[in-house]
Interface confidence: medium
């Protein structure tokens, strides 16, 4: 039975040119954790942090994405069409899978406020 | 290139326990990224996973046979062990050894990429 | 556990001929899919990974499409040797599962 919750950053903006963190938290399982992906919106996958083998980068995100913290992902150098959805997939034993989502805002404006707050889905 | 042989006996008595070896040559478990793997395939059916290894000896079982089955691992002999106890007729299958990932640099589950070329075990008294 | 259903469980088609097979997933599994061939007392074969990326040494006439939980393997003109039984799996979480197969036989 998966009993664990995924809480995320949420609705988030950041500014054009900027970084943001995106940021997932699984809670409330005892479940392991063997393997988080973080996705884009149209699954393609942007990076992988494998509890064995640690992190890897996918190579068309390599210039502007670095891992962590923890196991959420920085995106950096920030355009307007890194608008849209983000997955984080945790794939958890004996649980399966839990996903969160979360939308990332670029904004053009250089006030532009980085907001992000945890909330669940 | 790596390869993979299953042994181990054809016939298990029921009740018994059914042990399986893989042997891996063309490369050193110790130092691979990837997961070890036992599948099964019963007469006329399907796949099943039965469960993996990673070289550091971490498991994940199947939850529908977690309770019978222990899977190891040997870096010094390179080779990987399935264990499935109490075992009966529904256990008869052809079971196979495989490798998730081990031609992908890009690693993390990927799929079977290689396969043993399976051994047929038979539960019977 | 997620179950993967595979449709047709067979499928008659003539040599030459486009062979389309489907993969359902019960809840999503992103790019996580590959396929597999099996011909008679042989080892399964892997095709493709990732949904759409052809294994080493695959010839182009196979390709797999598809996404979250709908899945496609195309055979673009069926040679000989490709009959055989067609399996689907999720990489993506524990437990592994496959999915039913389906049969490809000449029609």
């Known amino acids: 039975m998966m009993t664990g919750t995924i809480e995320t950053t949420g609705n988030i903006s950041a500014k054009k040119g900027g970084s943001v963190i995106l940021q997932c938290h699984l809670s409330s399982t005892m479940a392991q954790v063997t393997q988080v992906n973080w996705e884009q919106h149209d699954h393609s996958l942007l990076a992988i942090r494998n509890a064995e083998l640690g992190w890897h980068i996918y190579p068309a995100f390599k210039d502007r994405v670095a891992p962590g913290p923890g196991l959420g992902l920085t995106l950096q150098s920030l355009t307007m069409n890194d608008t849209g959805e983000y997955f984080c997939t945790y794939h958890t034993y004996p649980d399966g899978t839990y996903r969160g989502r979360i939308f990332l805002e670029v904004l053009e404006s250089s006030v532009a406020e980085h907001s992000a707050r945890f909330q669940i889905p | 290139q790596l390869q993979l042989q299953e042994s181990g006996p054809g016939l298990v008595k029921p009740s018994e326990t059914l042990s399986l070896t893989c042997t891996v040559s063309g490369g050193s478990i110790s130092s691979g990224s990837y997961y070890l793997a036992w599948i099964r395939q019963p007469p006329g059916k399907g796949l099943e996973w039965i469960g993996s290894i990673f070289r550091s000896g971490s498991t994940y079982y199947n939850p529908s046979l977690e309770s019978r089955v222990t899977i190891s691992v040997d870096t010094s002999k390179n080779q990987f062990s399935l264990k499935l106890s109490s075992v009966t007729a529904a256990d008869t299958a052809v079971y196979y050894c495989a490798i998730e990932g081990a031609n992908f640099k890009d690693f993390g589950y990927v799929a079977f990429d290689i396969w043993g070329q399976g051994t047929t075990v038979t539960v019977s008294s | 556990e997620i179950v993967m259903t595979q449709s047709p469980a067979t499928l008659s088609v003539s040599p030459g001929e486009r062979a389309t097979l489907s993969c359902r997933a019960s809840k999503s599994v992103s790019s996580n899919l590959a396929w597999y061939q099996q011909k008679p007392g042989q080892a399964p074969r892997l095709l493709i990974y990732f949904a759409s990326t052809r294994a080493t040494g695959i010839p182009a006439r196979f390709s797999g499409s598809g996404s979250g939980t709908e899945f496609t393997l195309t055979i673009s003109s069926l040679q000989s040797e490709d009959f055989a039984v067609y399996y689907c799996?999720?990489?993506?979480?524990?437990?592994?599962?496959f999915g039913g197969g389906t049969k490809v036989e000449i029609k």
């Open positions: 799996q999720q990489t993506s979480p524990w437990p592994r599962t």
